[in-house]
């Protein structure tokens, strides 16, 4: 039950996170005009990954796309790439995790397969979240650098008689959305990886070996106890020795790599 809850919660958290990453990527407010200690302009500038916008005092907003690819800063291209990779990995992760959900039955899919898929989606979510966090952080760093450069320009000589308005940009809403969304996707991925441990067949069972002592018939069965995973007892998945007779196929199980995650 706890494994199902962990997996389900991981899926939901990742879903919200990826929706947030998509939203952040599409948002125009990655950087917004800094209004503090600046000339008060009758226009408000803000920029996204794909276009820059200007809102006039009337509320009229005009946006212009970055129609050049080669003319854009390499950092911006890198941020775009990181966000897109994050979205793609997240989307694939979501697709995989839907089939991995314990509450969803697909044919006769074994728990080991579901565990594999859960782990795969978890790793994808982790990488997706890291991509988003990295992308947003790179952009934020770029903003901070440009901010202090433009501040320096603002307070040094203009060189000529004519002054130009130095528009400084600060963090926009999309950065915060991206950081939070990336964090959620990361947390969701970690939860999926944890859930995977509970889904995996936990025991390495061996064929029962009978030792016949003279006079008494006592069966000794090794490997019947294993430490708790911390997610409660999962009676549905664990093979519990009931001492009853069983076929060779029932008893035989192989160690899985998930036992050691």
């Amino acid at each position: 039950m706890a494994v199902t809850a962990c997996q389900g919660l991981g899926f939901v958290v990742s879903l919200i996170g990826i929706a947030g990453i998509i939203a952040a990527t599409c948002m125009d407010q990655w950087s917004t005009q800094d209004l503090y200690n600046n000339p008060v302009t009758a226009v408000f500038n803000y920029q996204g990954l794909w276009r820059s916008c200007v809102r006039e005092s009337s509320g009229f907003t005009e946006c212009r796309g970055y129609f050049t690819l080669l003319g854009l800063p390499a950092m911006l291209q890198a941020v775009r790439a990181l966000m897109i990779v994050g979205i793609v990995l997240g989307a694939i992760g979501l697709l995989v995790s839907i089939f991995a959900l314990k509450c969803i039955r697909i044919g006769s899919m074994e728990d080991s397969a579901k565990a594999n898929m859960t782990l795969t989606s978890g790793i994808m979510f982790i990488v997706s979240g890291l991509c988003a966090i990295a992308g947003v952080s790179v952009f934020a760093n770029m903003l901070v650098t440009n901010f202090w450069m433009s501040t320096a320009n603002m307070y040094t000589g203009m060189g000529g008689m004519v002054q130009t308005v130095q528009t400084r940009y600060t963090f926009g809403a999309a950065l915060f959305v991206g950081w939070v969304a990336g964090g959620l996707t990361l947390i969701g991925g970690v939860m999926m990886c944890i859930a995977c441990r509970g889904l995996a067949p936990e025991e390495t069972n061996y064929k029962a070996v009978s030792y016949h002592a003279s006079g008494h018939s006592v069966a000794y069965k090794p490997g019947g106890f294993k430490a708790s995973t911390g997610f409660g007892s999962n009676t549905k998945n664990k093979k519990i020795y009931d001492g009853g007779a069983r076929t060779e196929d029932e008893v035989q199980s192989y160690p899985s790599k998930h036992d050691y995650v």
Epitope: T41, A42, N45, S52, E56, S57, S58, F60, Q163, T164
Partner: antibody, heavy 119, light 113 residues
């Protein structure tokens, strides 16, 4: 038809106060920023103040800052200019102007009301 | 504050001739975000309030005859009347609508020669 009608002008002594009003019709007043612009007799135009549609942004010319207060009542479709500590140089025709939708332009102007500051 | 300087102060042009009024700002009125210049031109006829002619330095307000055109960028702007008509006699003002306080030029009086 867009109409802006100023009122409240008149003769006032230096140091006195006056409140100008502007009644508007013909457009959704609450959606537009509004300006006050003045013109001294025989002189050029001087921008006085601006108030945004939701009153979040208010700006003044340096010459009137601290003495004039712009306000609006969207329910009454009215714009106001409270003028205190009036000086002789405040003598002018005061225009109520709508802020245009494009280019921060001043697109519709009232006929103006004359304010004379004299002893 | 941005200082707007118009030249000439007055101008006499024959009917049908081209009239050119210049406006210079002490700071650039160009906004890189949307590649627009925030300069507006107005026409004021005697005894009337001003009338909007051109915004964004070159975009004609609806209803304004196409003989009026605006040009320029950054700090230097021009209002051109391609073929002067009798009804164009007025004072013309340019205005900074980019940075508060918004400022007007001193005006250019256009007369018929």
């Amino acid at each position: 038809e867009v109409q802006l009608v100023e009122s409240g002008g008149g003769l006032v002594q230096p140091g006195g106060s006056l409140r100008l009003s502007c009644a508007v019709s013909g457009f959704t007043f609450s959606s537009f920023g509004m300006h006050w612009v003045r013109q001294a007799p025989g002189k050029g135009l001087e921008w006085v103040a601006y108030i945004s549609s939701g009153t979040t942004n208010i700006y003044y010319a340096d010459s009137v800052k601290g003495r004039f207060t712009v306000s609006r009542d969207n329910a009454k479709n009215s714009l106001y200019l409270q003028m205190n500590s009036l000086r002789a140089e405040d003598t002018a025709v005061y225009y109520c102007v709508r802020s245009g939708y494009y280019g921060n332009s001043l697109d519709y102007w009232g006929q103006g009301t004359l304010v004379t500051v004299s002893s | 504050d941005i200082v707007m300087t118009q030249s000439p102060d007055s101008l006499a042009v024959s009917l049908g001739e081209r009239a050119t009024i210049n406006c210079k700002s002490s700071q650039s009125l160009f906004n890189s975000g949307n590649q627009r210049n925030y300069l507006t031109w107005y026409q004021q006829k005697p005894g009337q309030p001003p009338k909007l002619l051109i915004y964004w330095a070159s975009t004609r307000e609806s209803g304004v005859p196409d003989r009026f055109s605006g040009s320029g960028s950054g700090t230097d702007f021009t209002l051109t009347i391609s073929s002067l008509q009798a009804e164009d006699v007025a004072v013309y003002y340019c205005q900074n609508v980019y940075i508060y306080p918004l400022t007007f030029g001193q005006g250019t009086k256009l007369e018929i020669k």
